[in-house]
């Protein structure tokens, strides 16, 4: 079975800068899975942001600002990366990755 690890416990960024969050997949080939990214703001329900499927298709939640989030995967390191552009107060949250095995 696949296993996920987010090596960064926390990430502190200056306003308007770019944040990159990593999710390392083990126990399964990343190219045979879909990786989903979610965020949970304090006091709010968890929210789907973006996913990258086994075939590389990217799906973004409607209502999420365009250009705010970018998702990628690096098969060599079995890692999925969530990039958050122009970090703002509204981006302060806990970010989770999740796996769906094909």
């Amino acid at each position: 079975a696949g296993h996920l690890e987010q090596p960064q416990i926390s990430s502190t960024k200056t306003l308007s800068k770019t944040a990159r969050l990593e999710c390392v997949v083990s126990g399964i080939t990343i190219s045979a899975t879909s990786v989903y990214w979610y965020r949970e703001r304090p006091g709010e329900v968890i929210q789907f942001l973006v996913s990258i499927s086994y075939d590389g298709t990217v799906r973004k939640e409607s209502g999420i600002p365009s250009g705010k989030f970018e998702v990628d995967r690096i098969p060599e390191t079995s890692t999925s990366t969530l990039t958050i552009h122009n970090v703002e107060k509204q981006d302060i949250a806990t970010y989770y990755c999740a796996l769906w095995e094909v």
């Epitope: 306003l15 709010e44 600002p65």
Partner: antibody, heavy 124, light 109 residues
């Protein structure tokens, strides 16, 4: 001194348009989310619209959605509210207000600096 | 949409007395997202309390906020003449971001 100064209010006929402006000074404008709040004569406060520091997140009250557009120019330290298809019920004092930012408890959202407001009257 | 209901609508007290103002939410509100404002006639609102219980800069310690979930309270321990005004609670949420209560008018008895 931290200051917000609104302008652009006035008398307009129903169906008309107005553009409100808010000039900010005394703080790093591009680090703060900003808001418009209105108050009809003799009534309570009503949130109208919000915009995040880099303009990624924009929200509107249902009462103005589709008729108002919030924007900001961080280079000019200015906040705007374009109001179209104005109605009598839009008559109010419009306040520009700053979110308290990310110092200290950055999870809290509240409006810590307010302008004195600009009056918008919609009447034929 | 979360609805905030303030009570009482009007509170008549004398200087030196204790004022207790209530704000009830139609559903649970994160304490981090509850604020109180004071507004005097002809003036813009002034932030008193944020995060349900933290006093804003320059606010006297006779003002205090408390509560969690759906019930929040603003207490003024000993009323001064300048405290007579209208008080609003406000919440920040996800849809829409902000809602205000209808206000409580604190008047001199």
């Amino acid at each position: 001194e931290v200051q917000l100064v609104e302008s652009g209010g006035g008398l307009v006929k129903p169906g008309g348009s107005l553009r409100l402006s808010c000039a900010a000074s005394g703080f790093t404008f591009n680090s703060y989310d900003m808001n418009w709040v209105r108050q009809a004569p003799g009534k309570g406060l009503e949130w109208v619209s919000s915009i995040s520091s880099s303009s990624s997140y924009i929200y509107y009250a249902d009462s103005v959605k589709g008729r108002c557009t919030i924007s900001r120019d961080n280079a000019r330290n200015s906040l705007y509210l374009q109001m179209n298809s104005l109605r009598a019920e839009d008559t109010a004092i419009y306040y520009c207000a700053r979110d308290r930012g990310i110092g200290g408890d950055y999870y809290s959202y509240a409006m810590d600096v307010w302008g004195q407001g600009t009056m918008v009257t919609v009447s034929s | 949409e979360i609805v905030l209901t303030q009570s009482p609508g009007t509170l008549s007290l004398s200087p030196g007395e204790r004022a207790t103002l209530s704000c009830r939410a139609s559903q649970s509100v994160s304490s981090s997202y509850l604020a109180w404002y004071q507004q005097k006639p002809g003036q813009a609102p002034r932030l008193l309390i944020y995060g349900a219980s933290s006093r804003a800069t320059g606010i006297p310690d006779r003002f205090s906020g408390s509560g969690s979930g759906t019930d929040f309270t603003l207490t003024i321990s000993r009323l001064e003449p300048e405290d007579f005004a209208v008080y609003y609670c406000q919440q920040y949420g996800s849809s829409p971001p902000y809602t205000f209560g209808q206000g409580t008018k604190l008047e001199i008895k």
